[in-house]
């Protein structure tokens, strides 16, 4: 048994620097406690963007200073990353861990390439 995680290949951030995508996992068991982590991979470096642990049926709770928000529905997690700029363009990987009950399972998506285009500044009007 293994856990497969699916996420879209490409997503475009909107003009306000917000990008949303769905992270879906095929759970081999009935998990009650799940941890979702968004990772950013640039070159061979992987860094954590945000993480949330939630009980099935409850809302995801990210830390107060997190740039992520999300909702869960069954084996789907709807993730939104805010405050993105052009320099944040990159591959965002969804990692899911079934923390409880045993056994533990971990699954990692192939990543979503998020493209961010900084808006053009408005021209000065006389």
């Amino acid at each position: 048994k293994a856990m497969h995680v699916a996420q879209p290949a490409v997503v475009l951030a909107n003009s306000r620097g917000t990008a949303s995508f769905v992270c879906e996992y095929a759970s081999p068991g009935k998990a009650t406690e799940v941890r979702v982590t968004v990772l950013r991979q640039a070159d061979s470096q992987v860094t954590e963007v945000c993480a949330a642990t939630y009980m099935m049926g409850n809302e995801l709770t990210f830390l107060d200073d997190s740039i992520c928000t999300g909702t869960s529905s069954g084996n789907q997690v709807n993730l939104t990353i805010q405050g993105l700029r052009a320099m944040d363009t990159g591959l965002y990987i969804c990692k899911v861990e079934l923390m409880y009950p045993p056994p533990y399972y971990m699954g990692i998506g192939n990543g979503t390439q998020i493209y961010v285009i900084d808006p053009e500044p408005c021209p000065d009007s006389d």
């Epitope: 293994a2 856990m3 995680v5 990772l39 954590e48 990692k95 923390m99 399972y105 971990m106 990692i108």
Partner: antibody, heavy 118, light 108 residues
């Protein structure tokens, strides 16, 4: 840089207890799950136990279940292994290891030797 | 529990030669959550390969991993003197985390 330093090993009699510590530095300890792995003299690697980010979820190998307890203090950046009812077959080098973002054990301590002998 | 069986137990080769190490799983290792570690005497294991084929940071490109499902391979294209060590495979997709029994690569 990432560093894991184990301590607390030594010689102990069968049936007695020992507590190992693993001091972590160079990374945000609370953001990583952790493991203990052991290696008996001249033998291979054996996974012992795992602990989640906040310490709420713990998993154990059948060989130590009910005797060993893993814990962590995120405020002190330290991982612990409480070993009770020690047996001769628990004699090994005990390593603490960090789970990397993508799952494998990316950093290991230098190990601490536990010898269970009368 | 996923049981990992490594072969051969010992590999006797000369520097410059190619080393091929095998790791077979008792059941499918999901999404290739398989790692390879190198361990030298008196040292802790060091991560070489994760995800079956991705090299860890700082690992030279003479080390490569391949395989999927139940059969995995670690290849060292040209053995350097510092490569003579014991190599372990490990699955990390589910508990309990398991290691193979190891393959010793020794100087012929």
């Amino acid at each position: 840089q990432v560093q894991l330093v184990e301590s607390g090993g030594g010689v102990v009699q069968p049936g007695r207890s020992l507590r190992l510590s693993c001091a972590a530095s160079g990374f945000t300890f609370s953001h990583y799950t952790m493991h203990w792995v052991r290696q008996a003299p001249g033998k291979g690697l054996e996974w012992v136990t795992f602990i989640s980010y906040d310490g709420n979820n713990k998993y154990y190998a059948d060989s130590v279940k009910g005797r060993f307890t893993i814990s962590r203090d995120n405020s002190k950046n330290t991982l612990y292994l409480q070993m009770n009812s020690l047996r001769a077959e628990d004699t090994a080098i005990y390593y603490c290891a960090r789970t990397g973002w993508l799952g494998p054990f990316d950093y290991w301590g230098q190990g601490t030797l536990v010898t269970v002998s009368s | 529990e996923i049981v990992l069986t490594q072969s051969p137990g010992t590999l006797s080769l000369s520097p410059g030669e190619r080393a091929t190490l095998s790791c077979r799983a008792s059941q499918e290792v999901g999404d290739s959550y398989l790692a390879w570690y190198q361990q030298k005497p008196g040292q802790a294991p060091r991560l070489l390969i994760y995800g079956a084929f991705s090299r860890a940071t700082g690992i030279p490109d003479r080390f490569s991993g391949s395989g999927s499902g139940t059969d995995f391979t670690l290849t060292i294209s040209r053995l350097e003197p510092e490569d003579f060590a014991v190599y372990y495979c490990q699955q990390y997709g589910s508990s309990p985390w398991t290691f193979g029994q190891g393959t010793k690569v020794e100087i012929k």
